[in-house]
C-alpha cells in the first residue's frame, strides 16, 4: 500500500483557494468502511474522515469553515484537501495520512505569497525647499525591496526612508518615500522588488503640472481677499446705520402734523 | 524518560460506563500519538485507539461506537470511555505511545485489571 | 483487519537452547516507503507490562540483548533467541503496524525446562 502525492510543493496566493492531493491505490469500488483520511499541518487537525464519517470536533479551530475533504474525489484514490481564502498561517508542511488495507502517509509542503500588487502613491511639496516628496504604500509577503527608478529606469539619489509594519492578516505593509528635486512631468517609478520571477510591481509617479507650485502663498491670497470682504461688508453696515441715525434726527427736528404722517415716515423708514 | 500510569476502578457493574485515566511524565501529549491497548484472560492483545498530539482519534471498528479517548493537555493526561460495559470485557488496560504514525509501542503502562461483574 | 498467526501457543526448552518463533501475516507488511516490514516483537514477563524488543522485523530496540535476532520479510517473520536464559521466560507477540487497526499475535508462551 502506497500513498504519492502528484506534487510536494504548492506555492500559493493569499486569499486565494488551494487543493493539495495524495493518490492512493483503489481497486474497483471503494469500500468507505475501511478507509481513514487524515490530513494535518504540523500541530493542528485538518480532517479526520475515518470510515465514512468527517469529524469537525477535532478539527483546528483556524481551518473551521474553510477546509474540506473532496469526498466525490475518495473513489477515484484521490485524498484532495480544498482550502479556501489562504492565510498566511496557511504555509507549511501537510501530511496525508490513509490506511485502507495498508496505511501510508506522505508530506506535501504549502508557501504562501502575497504580491504587492496594489500599491497606494502619494506627491507632496516642501514649500521650504520645493522638494518632491514621493510616497509609494503596498501590502505583501514576503519582504519587499522598493526600488525608485526615473523615465530612464535608472536609479534616483535622494533621501529615502522605508517603514514596515504587519496588517491584521499577518501581511507586511511596506511604505517608501523618496524626497527629490523635480520639476513638473518628471517620471518616477516605485517597484516592490522580489527575487521570484514575476514577483516585481511597479507604479507610475507623475509630478503634477502646476501642483500650486506656492500652495502656502496661494492659501494667503484667498486670506486676504476674505479679509477685504469682510471689512467692506463691516463698513457698508456701518454707513448704513449712520444714515438710519441722521433721517431718525430729521424727523425729530420737524415735528409731527398728524398720526397717519408718523405712521407713513416709520413704514418708509422701515422699508428703506 | 517517558512513564505512564494508569489509573481507575477495577471493578464496573454491567452496563455501566469504565473510564481511566493514563498520565503521562517525561514527554508531552502535545507530541506523538496516545493508544489503549487491552489483554484478555487468555492472553489475547486487542488495539482500541489511539489519541494523537493533534487531537485526532482513531478508534478500533470492533468497539463500535462504545469507544471515546479525550485528553487534558494542561495535566499531561488522556483519558479512555468505554460505554456499555458487558463481562467481555474484562481485561487488563493498557496505555502504550509511539511516536510516529506508523510505529511500534515502545512505550507501555503497567496495566490495571478491570473486572465487569454484577 | 489483517490477521496474525503464531506457532506453537507454548514452548518448553532447555536453558542455553537455541529457539525460533514463528509469526505470519494474512497479507504482506512491506512498508514501501522504506521497504522493510512493519512488524513488532514484544516480551511480556509474568506481571509486567509488554516490552518492545524487534521493529521493522529486524531492528532490535536500544537495550535489549543480541541474542534477540528478528527476520522474515512480506507475510513470514521468526524471533531468534539464539542462547536462552532463565530471564527469557515469557510470552512473546508479533503485532503489525502496517494498517489500521493495529493487530496483535495470539502469543507464544516460552517455559523453561
Known amino acids: 500500500f502506497t500513498v504519492t502525492v502528484p506534487k510536494d510543493l504548492y506555492v500559493v496566493e493569499y486569499g486565494s483557494n488551494m487543493t493539495i492531493e495524495c493518490k492512493f491505490p483503489v481497486e474497483k469500488q471503494l469500500d468507505l468502511a475501511a478507509l481513514i483520511v487524515y490530513w494535518e499541518m504540523e500541530d493542528k487537525n485538518i480532517i479526520q474522515f475515518v470510515h465514512g464519517e468527517e469529524d469537525l470536533k477535532v478539527q483546528h479551530s483556524s481551518y473551521r469553515q474553510r477546509a474540506r475533504l473532496l469526498k466525490d474525489q475518495l473513489s477515484l484514490g484521490n485524498a484532495a484537501l480544498q482550502i479556501t481564502d489562504v492565510k498566511l498561517q496557511d504555509a507549511g508542511v501537510y501530511r496525508c495520512m490513509i490506511s485502507y488495507g495498508g496505511a501510508d502517509y506522505k508530506r506535501i509542503t504549502v508557501k504562501v505569497n502575497a504580491p504587492y500588487r496594489k500599491i497606494n502613491q502619494r506627491i507632496s511639496v516642501d514649500p521650504a525647499t520645493s522638494e518632491h516628496e514621493l510616497i509609494c504604500q503596498a501590502e505583501g509577503y514576503p519582504e519587499a525591496e522598493v526600488i525608485w527608478t526615473n523615465s530612464d529606469h535608472q536609479p534616483v539619489s535622494g533621501k529615502r526612508s522605508v517603514t514596515t509594519s504587519r496588517t491584521e492578516g499577518m501581511l507586511l505593509n511596506v511604505t517608501s518615500s523618496l524626497r527629490v528635486n523635480a520639476t513638473a512631468n518628471d517620471v518616477f517609478y516605485c517597484t516592490f522588488w522580489r527575487s521570484q520571477p514575476g514577483q516585481n510591481h511597479t507604479a507610475e509617479l507623475i509630478i503634477p503640472e502646476l501642483p500650486a507650485t506656492h500652495p502656502p502663498q496661494n492659501r494667503t491670497h484667498w486670506v486676504l481677499l476674505g479679509s477685504i470682504l469682510l471689512f467692506l461688508i463691516v463698513v457698508s453696515t456701518v454707513l448704513l446705520f449712520l444714515r438710519k441715525q441722521v433721517r431718525m434726527l430729521d424727523v425729530e427736528k420737524c415735528g409731527v402734523e398728524d398720526t397717519s404722517s408718523k405712521n407713513r415716515n416709520d413704514t418708509q423708514f422701515e422699508e428703506t | 524518560e517517558v512513564q505512564l500510569q494508569e489509573s481507575g476502578p477495577s471493578l464496573v457493574k454491567p452496563s455501566q460506563t469504565l473510564s481511566l485515566t493514563c498520565s503521562v511524565t517525561?514527554?508531552?501529549?502535545?507530541?506523538?500519538?496516545w493508544n489503549w491497548i487491552r489483554k484478555f484472560p487468555g492472553n489475547k492483545l486487542e488495539y482500541m485507539g489511539y489519541?494523537?498530539?493533534?487531537?485526532?482519534?482513531y478508534y478500533n471498528p470492533s468497539l463500535k461506537s462504545r469507544f471515546s479517548i479525550t485528553r487534558d493537555t494542561s495535566k499531561n493526561q488522556y483519558f479512555l470511555q468505554l460505554n456499555s460495559v458487558t463481562t467481555e470485557d474484562t481485561a487488563t488496560y493498557y496505555c502504550?505511545?509511539?511516536?510516529?504514525?506508523?510505529?511500534?509501542?515502545?512505550?507501555w503502562g503497567q496495566g490495571t485489571l478491570v473486572t465487569v461483574s454484577a | 483487519d489483517i490477521v496474525m498467526s503464531q506457532s506453537p501457543s507454548s514452548l518448553a526448552v532447555s536453558v542455553g537452547e537455541k529457539v525460533p518463533l514463528s509469526c505470519k501475516s494474512s497479507q504482506s507488511l512491506l512498508y514501501s516507503s522504506n521497504q522493510k516490514s512493519s512488524l513488532a516483537w514484544y516480551q511480556q514477563k509474568p506481571g509486567q507490562s509488554p516490552k518492545l524488543l524487534i521493529y521493522w522485523a529486524s531492528t532490535r530496540e536500544s537495550g535489549v540483548p543480541d541474542r534477540f535476532t528478528g527476520s522474515g520479510s512480506g507475510t513470514d517473520f521468526t524471533l531468534t533467541i539464539s542462547s536462552v536464559k532463565a530471564e527469557d521466560l515469557a510470552v512473546y507477540y508479533c503485532?503489525?503496524?502496517?494498517?489500521?487497526?493495529?493487530?496483535f499475535g495470539s502469543g507464544t508462551k516460552l517455559e523453561i525446562k
Open positions: 489519541i494523537s498530539y493533534t487531537g485526532s482519534t
Open positions: 503485532q503489525q503496524y502496517y494498517g489500521y487497526p493495529f493487530t
Open positions: 517525561g514527554d508531552s501529549i502535545t507530541s506523538g500519538y
Open positions: 502504550a505511545s509511539y511516536e510516529g504514525w506508523l510505529l511500534p509501542f515502545a512505550y
